[in-house]
């Protein structure tokens, strides 16, 4: 029950997080005109990953897309890439996690398969969240650098008279949305990974005890270990991680009707 709750909660938290990452990526307010200690202008500038906007005092807003690809700063391209990778990984993770949910039955899918899918989606969510946090942080760092550069260059001209007042930009709402969304996706991913451990078949720490008969030998082992019919010295005690998949050195091991999994 706790496993189902953890998995379900992880899914919901990740879903909210990914929705937030998508929203942040689409938002125009990644950077907004700094109004503190600046002359009051009749226009307000703000910029996103895809376009920049100018809002007039009248309320009229004009946005222009960045129609060039090569002319854009490399950092902006990197941020775009990180956010898109985050969205794609998150979307795939959501798709995988839907099928991995314990409360949803699909055919005769074993718990071990669901555990694997849960782990996969969890890892995807973690990477997705990290991509978003990295993207937003890179952009924030770029803003901070530019802010102090423009502050240093703010007052130029003869005899201290203000000739040019540079527009300085500060953190926009999208950055905070991105950080929170990335964090939620990360938390959701961790929860999925935790749920995966509970979904995996039960394991014990008891040592396996093998009984060797003179001829055909059958090894009986407690739960969590795979019983194998051994021939000569090829009898092995193997711990199951993959829900029944055999490793290469088990090629000569044949299951019998006495196997306990």
């Amino acid at each position: 029950m706790a496993v189902t709750a953890c998995q379900g909660l992880g899914f919901v938290v990740s879903l909210i997080g990914i929705a937030g990452i998508i929203a942040a990526t689409c938002m125009d307010q990644w950077s907004t005109q700094d109004l503190y200690n600046n002359p009051v202008t009749a226009v307000f500038n703000y910029q996103g990953l895809w376009r920049s906007c100018v809002r007039e005092s009248s309320g009229f807003t004009e946005c222009r897309g960045y129609f060039t690809l090569l002319g854009l700063p490399a950092m902006l391209q990197a941020v775009r890439a990180l956010m898109i990778v985050g969205i794609v990984l998150g979307a795939i993770g959501l798709l995988v996690s839907i099928f991995a949910l314990k409360c949803i039955r699909i055919g005769s899918m074993e718990d071990s398969a669901k555990a694997n899918m849960t782990l996969t989606s969890g890892i995807m969510f973690i990477v997705s969240g990290l991509c978003a946090i990295a993207g937003v942080s890179v952009f924030a760092n770029m803003l901070v650098t530019n802010f102090w550069m423009s502050t240093a260059n703010m007052y130029t001209g003869m005899g201290g008279m203000v000739q040019t007042v540079q527009t300085r930009y500060t953190f926009g709402a999208a950055l905070f949305v991105g950080w929170v969304a990335g964090g939620l996706t990360l938390i959701g991913g961790v929860m999925m990974c935790i749920a995966c451990r509970g979904l995996a078949p039960e394991e014990t720490n008891y040592k396996a005890v093998s009984y060797h008969a003179s001829g055909h030998s059958v090894a009986y082992k407690p739960g969590g270990f795979k019983a194998s019919t051994g021939f000569g010295s090829n009898t092995k005690n193997k711990k199951i991680y993959d829900g029944g998949a055999r490793t290469e050195d088990e090629v000569q091991s044949y299951p019998s009707k006495h196997d306990y999994v």
């Epitope: 202008t41 007039e56 005092s57 009248s58 309320g59 203000v162 000739q163 040019t164």
Partner: antibody, heavy 117, light 113 residues
Framework: QVQLKESGPGLVAPSQSLSITCTVS????????VSWIRQPPGKGLEWLGV???????YYNSALKSRLSISKDNSKSQVFLKMNSLRTDDTAMYYC???????????WGQGSTLTVSS | DTVMTQSPSSLTVTAGEKVTMSCKSS????????????LTWYQQKPGQPPKLLIY???TRESGVPDRFTGSGSGRDFTLTISSVQVEDLAIYYC?????????FGAGTKVELK
């Protein structure tokens, strides 16, 4: 068609208060801003202030302490109030509509104010 | 406040002549967000309210004859009348439309010789 008409007292004694009303038609005060500009006799234009559709107002910094702009959207009226009038406040007072891009695209004919004892 | 300086204060011209007047701002009126210059030109004829001519430094208002041309960027702006007509005799004002408080220049008076 867009129209703006100013109506004021005409003559006011020094130290008294002034109230001029700008009645508009052909557009909504919730959508557009209205600015006030004055022009002393034989002199240039002086921007007094503006009130935007959302109700936020900006003023000429030299007159801010004695100036107030308000509006009544339902009556399509904008009000300019100025206190502690001096003789150098004698001027033609215009109200003008701000276009979406903020320039003054329509002007009233103006209201003459004389500050004299 | 942003100071707008217009020159010359008056011009005496003959009909058909090319007229150029200047407007200088104490601060740049160029907005980096959209690369537009927030400078507006108005024409005021005697006994009339001002009339909008040009906004964004170079965009003509609809109905304004194409003999009126606005140019310039940052702090220096120019209004040119390619072939002045009798009806163009008026006072021309430039306005800072970027920084609050919005400010007007003192005007350039165009008179007939």
């Amino acid at each position: 068609q867009v129209q703006l008409k100013e109506s004021g007292p005409g003559l006011v004694a020094p130290s008294q208060s002034l109230s001029i009303t700008c009645t508009v038609s052909g557009f909504s005060l919730t959508d557009y801003g209205v600015s006030w500009i004055r022009q002393p006799p034989g002199k240039g234009l002086e921007w007094l202030g503006v009130i935007w559709g959302g109700g936020n107002a900006y003023y000429n910094s030299a007159l801010k302490s004695r100036l107030s702009i308000s509006k009544d959207n339902s009556k399509s009226q904008v009000f300019l109030k100025m206190n502690s009038l001096r003789t150098d406040d004698t001027a033609m007072y215009y109200c003008a509509k701000n276009g979406l891009l903020r320039y003054l695209d329509y002007w009233g004919q103006g209201s003459t104010l004389t500050v004299s004892s | 406040d942003t100071v707008m300086t217009q020159s010359p204060s008056s011009l005496t011209v003959t009909a058909g002549e090319k007229v150029t007047m200047s407007c200088k701002s104490s601060q740049s009126l160029l907005n980096s967000g959209n690369q537009k210059n927030y400078l507006t030109w108005y024409q005021q004829k005697p006994g009339q309210p001002p009339k909008l001519l040009i906004y964004w430094a170079s965009t003509r208002e609809s109905g304004v004859p194409d003999r009126f041309t606005g140019s310039g960027s940052g702090r220096d702006f120019t209004l040119t009348i390619s072939s002045v007509q009798v009806e163009d005799l008026a006072i021309y004002y430039c306005q800072n439309d970027y920084y609050y408080p919005l400010t007007f220049g003192a005007g350039t008076k165009v008179e007939l010789k």
